[in-house]
């Protein structure tokens, strides 16, 4: 019960976090800053990863995409693929857990297989997480660096004195969104890979067989093994017997047809 | 790169109408706000009249009821028409355009500006 708790709560966590990933992406609020500022209206300006906008206070707003700007930061680029590489493995991670959930059942797949599916979405979740937290990161970086390496200089360009102008640069929601998203993703990532474990298959039942040597009044009776899977332990040292095998409690056995092999 | 073409400057009597004209060409992702200063001899630059993409005018004390800034976006043009001028308004008016950069600081780019002689 306890692992299917894990494993759901790992999947409606995970879930969200994918969510609040690609609405981080498609966000236009990565940046803002203020553009322009008089007695009579200002000009606010917030960047996405895909086009920038500008709303002044008196209502107007405008947005445009980046489309045929050159001289972007790289960075952009880099930030791009890392938020579209988390969304992706995101995804897959997904519909790879839609199957491996305990409380639904497909055909008469095993214990085992669902455990490995388990285990895989875990890992995509994981990478998902730190895709999305390091694209973020990155963005906020590159923020920063830009503001400092902006300083207000003036130089004289083809079309006369060209002044880089300071305006105060803000992390928009977006940066905020994607970090906890990020590491909402990472945590169902994790809590996927403990329900891993509790979902492999925790033995294997062998046959025990009481072999009897002929004149003898007492049987040899082999212990039942259990094989382990390596994730749980046979703490209760119980032995496992099936078919026509004797019971423990017996003293003497007699032979019979089923007890030669 | 930003190059501003400013026209419209001259010499004009006191009481006449000056309208002046700068347009803004090159390679620049959007251009925010587009306005006029000027420089009077031995005095230092002051704001005339801006204009913001979305059609915001501010316009200072001293040309208030005087003057009109209009913008073309389409063209990348501002427009300043000055009326009922005075001595006092004779100045080099300089066009100024804030350019937004991307994940950078804006820029603020200005015309070589246009002489405006206000004489009898």
């Known amino acids: 019960m306890a692992v299917t708790a894990c494993q759901g709560l790992g999947f409606v966590v995970s879930l969200i976090g994918i969510a609040g990933i690609i609405a981080a992406t498609c966000m236009d609020q990565w940046s803002t800053q203020d553009l322009y500022n008089n007695p009579v209206t200002a000009v606010f300006n917030y960047q996405g990863l895909w086009r920038s906008c500008v709303r002044e206070s008196s209502g107007f707003t405008e947005c445009r995409g980046y489309f045929t700007l050159l001289g972007l930061p790289a960075m952009l680029q880099a930030v791009r693929a890392l938020m579209i590489v988390g969304i992706v493995l995101g995804a897959i991670g997904l519909l790879v857990s839609i199957f491996a959930l305990k409380c639904i059942r497909i055909g008469s797949m095993e214990d085992s297989a669902k455990a490995n599916m388990t285990l895989t979405s875990g890992i995509m979740f994981i990478v998902s997480g730190l895709c999305a937290i390091a694209g973020v990161s990155v963005f906020a970086n590159m923020l920063v660096t830009n503001f400092w390496m902006s300083t207000a200089n003036m130089y004289t360009g083809m079309g006369g004195m060209v002044q880089t102008v300071q305006t105060r640069y803000t992390f928009g929601a977006a940066l905020f969104v994607g970090w906890v998203a990020g590491g909402l993703t990472l945590i169902g990532g994790v809590m996927m890979c403990i329900a891993c474990r509790g979902l492999a298959p925790e033995e294997t039942n062998y046959k025990a067989v009481s072999y009897h040597a002929s004149g003898h009044s007492v049987a040899y009776k082999p212990g039942g093994f259990k094989a382990s899977t390596g994730f749980g332990s046979n703490t209760k040292n119980k032995k496992i017997y099936d078919g026509g095998a004797r019971t423990e409690d017996e003293v003497q056995s007699y032979p019979s047809k089923h007890d030669y092999v | 790169e930003v190059q501003l073409v400013e026209s419209g400057g001259g010499l004009v009597q006191p009481g006449g109408s000056l309208r002046l004209s700068c347009a803004a060409s090159?390679?620049?992702?959007?251009?925010?706000?587009m306005g006029w200063y000027r420089q009077a001899p031995g005095k230092g630059r002051e704001l005339v009249a801006t204009i913001t993409r979305g059609g915001s005018s501010y316009y200072a004390d001293s040309m208030k009821g005087r003057s009109t800034i209009s913008r073309d976006n389409a063209k990348n043009t501002v427009y300043l028409q000055m009326n009922s001028l005075k001595p006092e308004d004779t100045a080099v008016y300089y066009c100024?355009?804030?350019?937004?950069?991307?994940?950078?600081?804006?820029?603020?780019?200005w015309g070589q500006g246009t002489l405006v002689t206000v004489s009898s």
């Open positions: 100024n355009v804030r350019v937004e950069v991307p994940f950078f600081q804006p820029n603020d780019y």
């Open positions: 090159g390679s620049f992702f959007r251009i925010v706000a």
